[in-house]
């Protein structure tokens, strides 16, 4: 009973939930279930009748394989779609889908909140702004990454002048998209000009 | 057996609005989308929207936006639909026609057809 | 928007022969798609849906097959009752519509 499949898609996409492994065999009923007890659509009999829920118009059940589609997925279908059938000797099989919907992160924003020329040294210290997502930093110099320690939403450093950039970039990404924004500065330490 | 019943034809101006309607029989109504379907004369079928019997909701063709309304009655398990601002080529054959399990995709029960006409 | 494209636009086959009409969607639809035929003054009937599974009554010389963008009904062999116009249909997720192919004409030879 533990066939639980983690599940991570981009919001206003078409989803289909369905299991790797083949429906047991002549089976006498198919259930879609949304978190545990809220039924979606039931197959029984070479017929199927989806239930009054959010769903009803955007999902459609194949019966074949038992796949559950569903069109344009927002936050509010994250949950564990359960999928529970009925084989011929009476006996409960199931399985667990947890829906992960995740919008697609937002172009960030470079703010350079210090430029400082400290005796041929650059400081420099720049946030990464984007409104309130849970994602992953990644900050480049003029494409080559920056150590994994530096890698948050303030990139903070003192820049020697081998190491100078002329160009910053904050990568912001979560598991179903990536956005960059860059800013660029005039050697040695100065905003540049747009 | 599922049976769905329409008014009959309807003869109106250009600018006019036109009322059709759909009974429907031998089912759960509020159960099944109804589906609203034309067809110009020797033309092919053109789907103009839906409704959901149970909670009234709606979903309108992009090109019907704006001057369609579908309506039901659960008592009277009949649905409606209006169609304003009439031009000549809104002369049809309208339908409605229920949908095969509920789902909202494919269409199995159709009534027999309302003739509309447009002309001055 | 998807778009359903029938071919031929119209078949001549003459009674007991092998019809075979054909969809292509402009983009994949998965196994989500319809046929129906309408004959004059009658309202359209459904044949076939989820591309391969028959509507309840339909006899079983009427099949379905094809997944993605090319779709075929096949007629095994053909009644008099048969001759008529064919339709594809498919639904867009978003927004949820319903489009038609342009129908195939199955006239007799």
């Known amino acids: 009973q533990g066939h639980l499949v983690h599940m991570t898609v981009v919001s206003g996409s078409n989803v289909t939930l369905n299991i790797s492994e083949s429906l047991p065999e002549n089976y006498k009923q198919l259930t879609w279930f949304y978190t545990f007890d809220q039924k979606i659509v039931e197959w029984d009999s070479r017929k199927s009748k989806y239930f009054e829920s959010k769903f009803k118009g955007r999902v459609r059940l194949d019966p074949q394989s038992g796949a559950l589609y569903i069109s344009k997925v927002q936050k509010e279908d994250n949950s564990t779609y359960i999928m529970r059938v009925l084989k011929k000797t009476g006996n409960e099989q199931e399985w667990k889908i947890k829906l992960q919907v995740l919008d697609p992160v937002p172009k960030p924003v470079i703010k350079i909140e210090k430029i400082e020329d400290m005796d041929d040294n650059c400081y420099l210290k720049l946030s990464c702004v984007i409104p309130g997502e849970s994602v992953n930093y990644t900050w480049y110099g003029d494409k080559r990454p920056f150590p994994k320690e530096l890698q948050n939403s303030v990139l903070e450093t003192t820049l020697m002048p081998h190491n100078y950039s002329r160009c910053y970039t904050c990568q912001v990404s979560n598991s179903v998209s990536s956005k960059n924004g860059t800013v660029c500065l005039s050697p040695p330490c100065t905003l540049a000009r747009s | 057996q599922v049976q769905l019943v329409q008014s009959g034809a309807e003869a109106r101006e250009p600018g006019a609005s036109v009322r059709v309607s759909c009974k429907a029989s031998g089912y759960t109504f509020t159960d099944y989308f109804i589906h609203w379907v034309r067809q110009a004369p020797g033309q092919g079928l053109e789907w103009m929207g839906w409704i959901n019997p149970n909670s009234g909701a709606t979903n309108f063709a992009q090109k019907f936006q704006g001057r369609v309304t579908m309506t039901r009655d659960t008592s009277l398990i009949t649905a409606y639909m209006d169609l304003s601002r009439l031009k000549s080529d809104d002369a049809a054959v309208f339908y409605c026609?229920?949908?095969?399990?509920?789902?909202?995709?494919?269409?199995?029960?159709w009534g027999q057809g309302t003739l509309v006409t447009v002309s001055s | 928007e998807i778009v359903l494209t029938q071919s031929p636009a119209t078949l001549s086959l003459s009674p007991g022969e092998r019809a075979t009409l054909s969809c292509r969607a402009s983009?994949?639809?998965?196994?989500?798609l319809a046929w129906y035929q309408q004959k004059p003054g009658q309202a359209p009937r459904l044949l076939i849906y989820d591309a391969s599974n028959r509507a309840t009554g339909i006899p079983a010389r009427f099949s379905g097959s094809g997944s993605g963008t090319d779709f075929t009904l096949t007629i095994s062999r053909l009644e008099p009752e048969d001759f008529a116009v064919y339709y594809c249909?498919?639904?867009?997720?978003?927004?949820?519509?319903?489009?038609f192919g342009q129908g195939t004409r199955l006239e007799i030879k």
């Open positions: 983009q994949s639809v998965s196994i989500y």
């Open positions: 249909q498919q639904r867009s997720d978003w927004p949820p519509s319903i489009t």
């Open positions: 026609a229920r949908d095969v399990d509920g789902s909202g995709w494919y269409l199995d029960f």
